[in-house]
Interface confidence: low
Amino acid sequence: QLPPGKPEIFKCRSPNKETFTCWWRPGTDGGLPTNYSLTYHREGETLMHECPDYITGGPNSCHFGKQYTSMWRTYVMMVNATNQMGSSFSDELYVDVTYIVQPDPPLELTVEVKQPEDRKPYLWMKWSPPTLIDLKTGWFTLLYEIRLKPEKAAEWETHFAGQQTEFKILSLHPGQKYLVQVRCKPDHGYWSAWSPATFIQIPSDFIMND
């Protein structure tokens, strides 16, 4: 029977910079029941606080609700593991909410085949930013990535759309049914999950771009 092994805070994420959650990995349990607590202070303050919510984020997590989330302060946090034989502490983790945002996927992805008379046909897609994201106050730029593939294909073709919320693709296989998805990330944060797939049938007379 031993003191617990050193825990590790391995991930913190915010959906919208208004709340965030951090997760830790326990170390070895030393063969005894082990209690975990997360404590934190805001940089520039000396007052230590305990995690306000161990429930919302699931096991081995700490959730910071709106009233505990400050956009403009760095959080310094650590996890304490304790059993009957002693304690161990994780390394301190510095968390700035600005840099841990992982938004929801973009919304309202629509895809159309455009066949102008005077030009080659193309696939046109547009989407909207996720509604939870406040695009101006806090941080400002969402970047988008599109992926598509014929329904039966194994490989995705990926296109970076920058800050645009619409995109054109010219090179497609006539007669194929394509799956199209889009995801987004703030410039300092993490990619969202891919949006639900939208399906589009490419007409058989679609002229390939040379």
Epitope: M71, W72, T98, P129, T131, D134, L135, K136, T137, W139, F140, T141, L142, Q163
Partner: antibody
Framework: EVQLVESGGGLAQPGGSLRLSCVAS????????MSWVRQAPGKGLDWVGN????????NYVDSVRGRFTISRDNAKNSLFLQMNSLRAEDTGVYYC?????????WGQGTLVTVSS | DIQMTQSPSSLSASVGDSVTITCRAS??????LDWFQQKPGKAPKSLIY???ILQGGVPSRFSGSGYGTDFTLTISSLQPEDFATYYC?????????FGPGTKVDIK
């Protein structure tokens, strides 16, 4: 095309009240933060405050906090600025502005004059 | 509050000149900075957001740069319609604050 039209400006006595309105069109009003900005005659721009999409959060500059209240009615695409306990230094043109991803859009402003 | 300063406060230039306006923040604001142009009797117009990204429809002769505390707005070849007052504004933290403005007039 984004359009913002302010109204409600005019002459008010020191200590008096005014309510400014801003009607928005050309974008989905309910999905954006909105701001009020003012400009004293011949002076620079001063941010007054803003309001979150659903109206649940407002932020104000210290000089107006407790006297001014920002609100919105998303059903009517309208933004409001209730100004109480007006002072001479509140005189100026008041603009409403959208806080869009790609920069701001501004109304043409409404003039507020506080004088006895 | 974050203080924003601009220099120069005014400048005289000729059509075709290259003009640079500097904006400085009293603390680090990353690139949470906008530039606005205002003409007399008109509302401000957004030129640049996020310190360097040109607003749609703004001519490419305008450019912005900087990060942290020091920022610049450059007009590469001044046109008659560019004579105006230019403001920077930070939106890193509340209250948002504007610089005092730089008036660009005809030499």
């Amino acid at each position: 095309e984004v359009q913002l039209v302010e109204s409600g400006g005019g002459l008010a006595q020191p200590g008096g009240s005014l309510r400014l309105s801003c009607v928005a069109s050309g974008f989905t009003f309910s999905t954006y933060w909105m701001s009020w900005v003012r400009q004293a005659p011949g002076k620079g721009l001063d941010w007054v405050g803003n309001i979150k999409q659903d109206g649940s959060e407002q932020n104000y500059v210290d000089s107006v906090r407790g006297r001014f209240t920002i609100s919105r009615d998303n059903a009517k695409n309208s933004l409001f600025l209730q100004m109480n306990s007006l002072r001479a230094e509140d005189t100026g043109v008041y603009y409403c502005a959208t806080l869009l991803t790609k920069g701001d859009y501004w109304g043409q402003g409404t003039l507020v004059t506080v004088s006895s | 509050d974050i203080q924003m300063t601009q220099s120069p406060s005014s400048l005289s230039a000729s059509v075709g000149d290259s003009v640079t306006i500097t904006c400085r923040a009293s603390q680090d604001i990353s690139n949470y900075l906008d530039w606005f142009q205002q003409k007399p009797g008109k509302a401000p117009k957004s030129l640049i957001y996020a310190a360097s990204i040109l607003q749609g429809g703004v001519p490419s002769r305008f450019s912005g740069s900087g990060y942290g505390t020091d920022f610049t707005l450059t007009i590469s070849s001044l046109q008659p319609e560019d004579f105006a007052t230019y403001y920077c504004r930070q939106y890193k933290t509340y209250p948002f604050t504007f610089g005092p403005g730089t008036k660009v007039d005809i030499k």
